[in-house]
């Protein structure tokens, strides 16, 4: 059980107030984290509160401003990047968001040696991506879908690719589906460790069907947004990987890296690229049917100036019970010998663990094991491996950082974070300096987040980087809800849940229940993290009980739970929410006539199906930007879990699992359907089809659209959205306004 800062004295109670919706919408109780921008083993940069860029040296204790806020302001810079030789800084301004990760911006190069902006051969605008080489001050950037290289910031650019074309050919940046569902980055180019080579992906979207939607704007006629977007079963992008020698880029030009034969025999994806040395690179490929992944280690052949990927250096990862990997196939972390590596994949018991691969995957040495999962490998040094897992005290929703020794006697495994601030901190991430000389720990909760700096050798805390004192003080007179994390055992399935309870919760009373659901494959909602958000307000002020449940299909509890939903999305996720609700009713403090469910995106899909389950459990519910049919969603994501929508594959379940097929069942619930009209991710089409099916079935429902808003419903739409949903729930639960 996680209890928020205790409020024991009744005399204090009258000075305390509940959370308001305004608190949430204004972000009054948001927290800060501190991630050092490491530039060496013992130095980092940080943007101060007054916008100076400050360099900190941990060992000398000194700090100095390398770039003043005045310089930043002169070009309205919102971001910066220091070149590794520390001679130049790029300043980023005119940020213009595109999709989830991508944006365009204007870049200025500032010369630190003379305190002036570099004039001559200025960068074009807007640029889609720009980065320094890992050594020196070479620049690679993407402009109008082509890649350019500068040996020095003031030099004229060398154009590497020439075939880039909007919505057709993408060089060095991903197309929509690769950005969202495969790479999870705005870039698709990678410098070799010393900047000798530059690898990049080329995505050919020529044959991909286009999603088109109106953007209303302010003009007389709406614009049409066109995005090559492969839906399930549609033609996919064609990907090629090239590497160019950046020292003599014109000498032989870009060289294509061969695709493993077993991958190239049918539709495939490129999933990631990892440089090992300047002359060794590791590529990961995935069959379109995403249960086979191949990791290919390629070497530069000086004599031919080509990249050779011998079959002996191909490592196959295959899943027989689901898809390959978790959400993504994990990436390797190479050892100092530049051939062996560490990687997370399922062990024989179906738990994701760290393995050490020296020659073949079959001979992999399992480094961690148990009925828990290794989640991320942060860093491998010559004597330590740092990773995170949810092993500690068997709570899957926690994250602690561990260190395993390599080559020291005796070997040791140590939990670095488990006992640091045990009540306050149970969910950590970490950021390491070069050679893991120092690291920052960022604790996300369950208490107020705190960021600390540590010695990488001894693990001693050096200083607090951010402890959110202002937030702590602001919360002193707030009646926060109580939170508890527990589990239900049902038919050999463990359902972890988080329950958010009103401050004066009394088990003998009856409370309305709101289920907040996401439930997508490899997601996790029940986490030991701090949050003061809309559901906190609903518990604090409106007296609701809110529950989040991780059912089948969710992550970090083993493959049995994770892969249970394989090829049948929309079945068990919904069943498990319903099962949990029944268990909550049995607890005795839930008013079974006042139960609601809400979710966003995948959660909107699950909440819709739960409302249409015919159980009579739910009085009302809300779906925000829901998927309504898997035929409408992106190929890479959908097919990973569902296979193909073809007769000889899984078309039947594609058809059976739509929200529209259950339109009739919405008759006895109050349904609020919400969507942004400019949703590039879950297209408005999804809600349009739900609405059409409900109308055709003559079922009454409520709806709200947000004009020109995407999947995030940001800005003023956020305020409107949460206000609207609050009114809907209060009406449903017969709570006075």
């Amino acid at each position: 059980i996680v209890l928020r800062p205790s409020r024991v004295h009744n005399s204090e109670e009258n000075t305390m107030r509940a959370l308001t919706l305004k608190d949430i919408l204004n972000g009054t109780f948001s927290y800060k984290t501190f991630f050092p921008n490491w530039i060496s083993g013992q130095e980092y940069l940080h943007q101060s509160a007054d916008n100076n860029i400050v360099l900190y040296n941990i060992e000398t204790g000194q700090s100095y401003t390398i770039l003043s806020n005045r310089t930043m302001k002169s070009v309205n810079a919102s971001n910066y990047g220091l070149s590794p030789d520390r001679q130049f800084v790029y300043l980023e301004s005119d940020y213009s968001k595109l999709w989830r990760y991508s944006y365009t911006a204007t870049y200025y190069i500032y010369d630190l040696s003379n305190g002036e902006f570099v004039r001559g051969n200025e960068l074009p605008r807007p640029i889609q991506y720009l980065c320094w080489s890992p050594v020196g001050s070479k620049l690679a950037y993407v402009y109008q879908n082509n890649i350019y290289l500068k040996q020095r910031p003031g030099d004229p650019p060398f154009q590497i690719t020439f075939n880039g074309r909007e919505n057709k050919i993408f060089n060095g940046i991903p197309d929509w589906v690769y950005e969202e569902e495969m790479l999870a980055t705005k870039y698709a180019l990678w410098w070799s460790p010393n900047g000798k080579f530059l690898a990049y992906a080329e995505f050919n979207d020529t044959d991909i069907p286009v999603i088109a939607y109106s953007y209303y704007g302010d003009e007389q006629y709406p614009r049409t947004i066109n995005i090559p977007y492969p839906k399930a079963g549609a033609k996919n992008p064609v990907v090629r990987i090239f590497i160019i020698d950046t020292t003599y880029p014109a000498y032989v030009g870009p060289q294509e890296v061969p695709v493993p034969a077993m991958i190239a025999s049918s539709d495939y994806y490129f999933s990631w690229l990892t440089w090992v040395t300047d002359e060794r690179v590791c590529l990961q490929w995935l069959k379109r049917v995403q249960n086979v992944s191949v990791l290919s280690i390629c070497d530069f052949r000086e004599d031919w100036q080509t990249w050779d990927c011998p079959k002996t250096q191909e490592h196959i990862e295959e899943s027989r019970t689901g898809w390959a990997g978790g959400f993504f196939v994990s990436t390797p972390v190479f050892s100092y010998d530049a051939i062996s590596y560490y990687k997370i994949f399922s062990d024989k018991d179906g738990y994701k663990h760290i393995h050490y691969i020296k020659d073949t995957v079959e001979n992999a040495i399992q480094i961690t094991s148990g009925k828990w999962e290794a989640i991320n490998i942060f860093r491998v040094t010559q004597d330590s491996l740092f990773y995170s897992s949810n092993e500690f005290e068997e709570y899957p929703g926690r994250r602690n950082i561990y260190r395993i020794s390599i080559g020291s006697y005796p070997p040791s495994k140590k939990c670095v974070t488990c006992h640091l601030r045990k009540e306050r901190c149970q969910y950590y991430t970490a950021s390491f300096s070069d050679y893991a000389k120092y690291y920052a720990l960022v604790c996300y909760g369950p208490g107020i987040p705190i960021s600390t700096l540590h010695d990488g050798r001894t693990d001693q805390e050096i200083k607090i980087l951010e402890e959110n004192k202002e937030l702590e003080n602001a919360l002193k007179n707030i009646q926060l809800p109580k939170e508890e994390i527990k589990k239900l055992e049902v038919d050999e399935i463990t359902l972890w849940y988080k329950m958010i309870l009103p401050p004066q919760f009394d088990r003998s009373k009856k409370y309305p229940l709101l289920i907040q659901v996401y439930g997508g494959p490899c997601s996790q909602s029940v986490r030991s993290v701090f949050a003061v958000n809309w559901i906190s307000y609903l518990a604090s002020k409106e007296g609701m009980v809110i529950a989040l449940v991780d059912g089948r299909g969710t992550a970090f509890q083993g493959d049995k739970l994770l892969y249970a939903v394989y090829r049948k999305l929309g079945v068990y996720e919904v069943e498990d929410q319903i099962t949990a609700v029944r268990k909550f009713i049995e607890m005795g403090f839930i008013d079974e006539k006042r139960i609601a469910i809400w979710g966003w995106s995948y959660g909107g899909y699950v909440s819709s199906l739960a409302l249409a389950s015919g159980t009579g459990l739910f009085k009302c519910g809300i779906a925000v930007a829901p998927v309504s049919s898997w035929e409408y969603y992106a190929s890479v994501y959908t097919e990973r879990f569902m296979g193909l929508p073809t007769k000889d594959d899984n078309l039947e379940h594609y058809k059976n699992s739509t929200v529209m097929a259950r339109a009739e069942y919405f008759r006895n619930v109050d349904y609020l359907l919400i969507h942004g009209t400019a949703d590039d991710n879950v297209h408005f089409q999804n809600s349009a089809q739900i609405a059409k099916a409900l109308v055709n079935a003559q079922v009454d429902f409520q709806a709200m659209w947000y004009s020109d808003q995407n999947h995030g419903l940001s800005g003023l739409s956020t305020n409107h959205l949460y206000t609207h949903m609050t009114h809907f729930l209060k009406q449903c639960f017969s709570l006075s306004d």
Epitope: Y356, I365, Q366, S369, G370, G407, P410, P411
Partner: antibody
């Protein structure tokens, strides 16, 4: 070729002392941790003590702690086990073993032929 | 200390047989388990490390599996030179305990 050659075993009275040596060749001695493992007559194997490559860290089984001392001389490529306050139950063949690592774990990849220590009055 | 229990303590088998020896740890030891072979009057010899990795020079008829608490050593087709005593050993935490041994004899 890796070779480990133990010496110094023999008959000793209870309460007495003995010093075992292990001469190593065929590998970079200072780069590897080393260990002593013993086997009582007709019985199984028992780990006794271990030492890091530099000699800076030493470890002992509870049964010998405070009585035995492991050490090494990297300039002579030699491992030692100083055994004091010997008891009858210390009677065993003592093996010197080279330790190799994999991440988080170790194994004894090379063993000497063993030297017999008999503690008896 | 972590206890290592081998079973059976002894077994009789014929040349060509497939033989399995099991080793159980008193607590989870991940994959930090090694297997050794010892012939009478000789020093032990490493067969398998890290539960399933074959030491170089060891015939491929030897294989290891398992993680956590339960481990097995399998000899796919017994050869005359394989009759010996086999020990498992954990390297998860000090002291690095061995199993009591399994004596493999000719039937």
């Amino acid at each position: 070729e890796v070779q480990l050659l133990e010496s110094g075993g023999g008959l000793v009275q209870p309460g007495g002392s003995l010093r075992l040596s292990c001469a190593a060749s065929g590998f970079t001695f200072s780069s590897y941790a080393m260990s002593w493992v013993r086997q009582a007559p007709g019985k199984g194997l028992e780990w006794v003590s271990g030492i890091s490559g530099s000699g800076g860290s030493t470890y002992y089984a509870d049964s010998v702690k405070g009585r035995f001392t492991i050490s090494r001389d990297n300039s002579k490529n030699t491992l030692y086990l100083q055994m004091n306050s010997l008891r009858a139950e210390d009677t065993a063949v003592y093996y010197c073993a080279k330790i190799s690592f994999y991440p988080g774990g170790t194994y004894f990849d090379y063993w000497g032929q063993g030297t017999l220590v008999t503690v008896s009055s | 200390d972590i206890q290592m229990t081998q079973s059976p303590s002894s077994l009789s088998a014929s040349v060509g047989d497939r033989v399995t020896i099991t080793c159980r740890a008193s607590q989870s030891i991940s994959s930090y388990l090694n297997w050794y072979q010892q012939k009478p009057g000789k020093a032990p010899k490493l067969l398998i490390y890290a539960a399933s990795s074959l030491q170089s020079g060891v015939p491929s008829r030897f294989s290891g599996s398992g993680s956590g608490t339960d481990f097995t050593l399998t000899i796919s087709s017994l050869q005359p030179e394989d009759f010996a005593t086999y020990y498992c050993q954990q390297s998860y935490s000090s002291p690095y305990t061995f199993g009591q041994g399994t004596k493999l004899e000719i039937k």
